[in-house]
């Protein structure tokens, strides 16, 4: 039976046409089956560290060793792949760091950073100084191994100079890379010495070589691409969010819910309310009201903003997130103070959210 009674039958609009709602990427650790993997929790000043995998508490077992800030997985299997998190609990707050583990036969490391394109990579030479091709920005080429989640965009760059201006071509696994070799083709931006592949799939895995040449010479550089296949999982909510808040009567406040979900999440903000002076219905279940939800008429559903609050707004606010796999929810309390008891700051605002893909 339901765990609550809705005060009013809120008619939910159809879901908004989805955007790519996840923005930043966790670090990706790749291991081959059978290998051991060690990850250090990259959080400082941790009094107590707890670990989760796909939102479920992770404890030590015969293959998982937890020592201080280190997580060791012995004899990794594909089942160990997933979204991991370590949470550092301190006396005043807690912080969570997320990373992905991918156990696959492919060798790779890291993931592709989104360099800002700059025409400064296009170097013009004095027409008298004939020169063989050379690299103009080796820093952008240092990372040879790229592990990128499926459906993301990959950009490989080989900024070069020379006189006359060199030409650039690309090879995949040592052979000419043709547009028809991948669905959707690829883009080459000669001005920025880059190869761009959108919406990568597992068949894009391999070695990509840029060959830069003019009549005075030829240079080349090879990148290895691994496409990390993801596992669908229940929504995962960042620990500590939404955070408890306090404000004075007439003040404004924001609650933030930070969601990690491959599958499109549906977000609801719910509050315990009273009906006819009672917090509970005849069935003993609490009365709840949906204040906001993701949908066509709702922008930025992961933030609940309350303006000009009254004492009646005090209470527990629940961020409930669902995708087709499962649900997750976390709550926070709002304390509303009389004007003369103003806290240190009137407006309690937490960091702006971003989705993770």
């Amino acid at each position: 039976r339901p765990s609550f009674s809705l005060v009013e039958d809120t008619t939910l609009e159809p879901e908004e046409p989805p955007t790519k709602y996840q923005i930043s990427q966790p670090e990706v650790y790749v291991a081959a089956p059978g290998e051991s993997l060690e990850v250090r929790c990259l959080l400082k000043d941790a009094a107590v560290i707890s670990w989760t995998k796909d939102g479920v508490h992770l404890g030590p077992n015969n293959r998982t060793v937890l020592i201080g800030e280190y997580l060791q997985i012995k004899g990794a299997t594909p089942r160990d792949s997933g979204l991991y998190a370590c949470t550092a609990s301190r006396t005043v707050d807690s912080e969570t760091w997320y990373f992905m583990v991918n156990v696959t036969d492919a060798i790779s490391s890291g993931d592709d950073e989104d360099d800002t394109d700059g025409a400064e990579d296009f170097v013009s030479e004095n027409s008298n100084n004939k020169r063989a091709p050379y690299w103009t920005n080796t820093e952008k080429m240092e990372k040879r191994l790229h592990a990128v989640p499926a459906a993301n965009t990959v950009k490989f760059r080989c900024p070069a100079g020379g006189n006359p201006m060199p030409t650039m071509r690309w090879l995949k696994n040592g052979k000419e890379f043709k547009q028809e070799h991948r669905i959707g083709g690829y883009k080459v931006r000669n001005q920025h010495w880059s190869l761009i592949m959108e919406s990568v799939v597992p068949s894009d895995k391999g070695n990509y070589t840029c060959v830069v040449e003019n009549e005075y010479g030829s240079i080349n550089h090879t990148y290895h691409l691994d496409v990390v296949e993801r596992s669908p999982h229940r929504p995962i909510l960042q620990a500590g969010l939404p955070a408890n808040a306090s404000t004075v009567v007439g003040g404004d406040v924001e609650f933030v819910c930070k969601v990690y979900s491959d599958a499109q999440p549906h977000i609801q903000w719910i509050k315990h309310v009273e009906k006819n002076g009672s917090k509970y219905g005849p069935d003993g279940l609490p009365y709840l009201k949906v204040l906001k939800h993701s949908g066509i008429n709702s922008s930025n559903a992961e933030v609940l903003a309350l303006f000009n609050v009254t004492e009646a707004d005090a209470g527990e606010y629940i961020c409930k997130v669902s995708n087709y796999i499962g649900q997750a929810n976390q709550s926070a309390w709002l304390t509303v103070l009389p004007k003369q008891q103003a806290p240190g700051r009137e407006k309690e605002i937490t960091a702006s959210p971003d989705y993770l893909e």
């Epitope: 046409p17 989805p18 089942r79 792949s81 990568v200 669908p232 491959d262």
Partner: antibody
């Protein structure tokens, strides 16, 4: 391993009701949505709705509201779908399906035949 | 609701040939999911999150696309690949399936 085992075939008369069960094992039943799908003979797949056993949240395809009722018994890790006021067009194979850990699992299907 | 249209309805090819199955959505979806079904059997999850192969699915299968247009490709058909393939979206309730593409031996 994860298993979804559905109840056997049913033959019902028009106007009657039928309750199809889906017994699960090998995973935490309460932590994942259980979805139900209809497939009429020789036809494609049609989404009916889902139940979240932990709190009994339900989400129905509007077309099946009033026709299907989804429930769950957490003590036996079993999901149920009751179809009411049966008509000949309800004759179909009904599947339960859900994600557990990182994979999708389907029951073997239950054939419900509505015939006078 | 989001309507998924699969084309062609029937695709007749020979083993060894390349197969391209399309799924078009009436409005944008985040990801597409694909299932294979053989007569008398339950659908089997085949591709999830647009491009990821379900466990045990051979590498000759691949999925791609974004927005409203998605594709399932089989690089070189094997006899066991002949079946009905359905696409599905989990982005916006009510979750919907395409009408299916029947891949048959020529």
């Amino acid at each position: 391993q994860v298993q979804l085992v559905q109840s056997g075939a049913e033959v019902k008369k028009p106007g009657a009701s039928v309750k199809v069960s889906c017994k699960t094992s090998g995973y935490t039943f309460t932590s994942y949505w259980m979805h139900w799908v209809k497939q009429a003979p020789g036809q494609g797949l049609e989404y009916i709705g889902a139940i979240y056993p932990e709190n009994a949240d339900t989400d129905y395809n509007q077309k099946f509201k009033g026709k299907a009722t989804l429930t769950a018994d957490t003590s036996t890790s079993t999901a149920y779908m009751e179809l009411s006021s049966l008509r000949s067009e309800d004759t179909a194979v009904y599947y339960c399906t859900g994600y557990a850990y990182d994979a999708a699992y389907w029951g073997q299907g239950t054939l419900v035949t509505v015939s006078s | 609701e989001i309507v998924l249209t699969q084309s062609p309805a029937t695709l007749s090819l020979s083993p060894g040939e390349r197969a391209t199955l399309s799924c078009s959505a009436s409005s944008s979806v985040s990801y597409m999911y694909w299932y294979q079904q053989k007569p008398g059997q339950a659908p089997r999850p085949w591709i999830y999150l647009t491009s990821n192969l379900a466990s045990g699915i051979p590498a000759r299968f691949s999925g791609s696309g974004s927005g409203t247009d998605f594709t399932l490709t089989i690089s070189s058909l094997e006899p066991e690949d002949f079946a009905v393939y359905y696409c599905q979206q989990w982005s916006s309730p009510p979750y919907t399936f395409g009408g299916g593409t029947k891949l048959e031996i020529k």
